[in-house]
């Protein structure tokens, strides 16, 4: 068998809502994956499991089952959404995300995804990890790979 390639493309969109009373942030993050089948036979994408971390704390998980079939030498782009919640001991981020005096409301999240594929009764798991920027201050739609992680520092003005 030839390889099945999984490429994490990036964050497609992030939709944010808040609970002011609970100082809680809800982020629905839609990610894009490219899955390429380099074989001369079809493979089944059985499931995609994903989780999102902020500062080493898991803030969201998702699992998609019976997703699609990828034909021989074909590629499919798959979007999946992870609902995340930043609350409790992380609720200081509520202020960072909502204060108008802060001009940039990006946070760095670690996206982890595992794709399980199957062919001829054989299962294979491929995992990817990527740090991404997500805007927690407004609803955002991203160009692909626009949310890649870099690092610069400045104080709140």
């Amino acid at each position: 068998p030839r390889s099945i390639e999984v490429k994490y493309i990036g964050v497609k969109s992030a939709y944010v809502s808040y609970d002011a009373e609970k100082r809680t942030i809800y982020l629905n993050i839609t990610n894009t994956l490219n899955i390429t089948n380099n074989n001369y036979y079809s493979v089944e994408v059985e499931n995609i499991t994903a989780q999102v971390q902020f500062s080493k704390t898991v803030i969201g998980k998702a699992r998609l089952n019976n997703i699609t079939n990828i034909g021989p030498l074909d590629m499919k782009q798959i979007d999946y959404t992870v609902p995340t919640v930043i609350a409790e001991e992380m609720s200081y981020m509520y202020d960072f995300c909502t204060l108008l005096s802060i001009k940039v409301h990006n946070i760095v999240l670690m996206m982890q995804v595992t794709v399980t594929t199957a062919y001829f009764g054989h299962s294979e798991q491929i995992s990817q990890e990527r740090y991404q920027y997500v805007d927690c201050g407004r609803n955002t739609t991203y160009q692909l790979a626009q949310s890649e992680y870099l690092n610069v520092l400045q104080p709140q003005q």
Epitope: Y94, L100, I107, N151, L153, Q156
Partner: antibody
């Protein structure tokens, strides 16, 4: 110049309440959140909680829930902390401190960049 | 809650010397640690934030390092005005917690 002005020492009776003001000047009051910190005699610092002056939203250290109440008066740029049902355990110096968020492309952390001079509270009959 | 163990609690040194103060967190706090200086009759001063970034206006003889669970404040070439109380504070998760403090005195 950023300043956080706190009131003078307070001597209060057990079971009573006290309300400590923290008047902010030199910056836009609603641009930053305010934290409160306790320092008992000969001890380290304990974080009490924090308030966002924009909406009055608060988050408390579980240990101080029911003991401390944080409020703000935007018109006078003043933050307040009320301590109730006072006991000798509440005798301490209480500080207000401005919380600043650091960011560039993204969130990079925060700190208490300006502190009040502290208000000493003594609980005694 | 994240426990912060600060050491030593007391330190005697002479002007011109270099000293280090350590803080250890009970779990990973990434880089989210700040250092403060406390002096009688003065308001507390922020020295270092995000583990290693020097606050504006603080002399470069102060430096911070570390991430995860272990952090260090270094003061090189001590000046007379550096003799004070020092505290570290984690801000990775609520409730914020402080180290027990280090009293730096003149030898």
């Amino acid at each position: 110049e950023v300043q956080l002005q706190q009131s003078g020492p307070e001597l209060v009776k057990p079971g009573a309440s006290v309300k400590i003001p923290c008047k902010a000047s030199g910056y836009t009051f609603t641009d930053y959140t305010m934290d409160w910190v306790k320092q008992s005699p000969g001890k380290s610092l304990e974080w009490i909680g924090h308030i966002n002056p924009n909406d009055g939203g608060t988050f408390y250290n579980q240990k101080f829930k029911g003991k401390a109440t944080l409020t703000v008066d935007k018109s006078s740029s003043t933050a307040y902390m009320e301590l109730r049902s006072l006991t000798s355990e509440d005798s301490a110096v209480y500080y207000c401190a401005r919380w600043v968020y650091y960011y560039g492309i993204s969130y990079e952390g925060g700190a208490m960049d300006y502190w009040g001079q502290g208000t000493s509270v003594t609980v005694s009959s | 809650d994240v426990q912060i163990t600060q050491s030593p609690s007391y330190l005697a040194a002479s002007p011109g010397e270099t000293i280090t103060i350590n803080c250890r967190a009970s779990k990973s706090i990434s880089k989210y640690l700040a250092w403060y200086q406390e002096k009688p009759g003065k308001t507390n001063k922020l020295l270092i934030y995000s583990g290693s970034t020097l606050q504006s206006g603080i002399p470069s003889r102060f430096s911070g390092s570390g991430s995860g669970t272990d952090f260090t404040l270094t003061i090189s070439s001590l000046e007379p005005e550096d003799f004070a109380m020092y505290y570290c504070q984690q801000h990775n998760e609520y409730p914020w917690t402080f180290g027990g403090g280090t009293k730096l005195e003149i030898k």
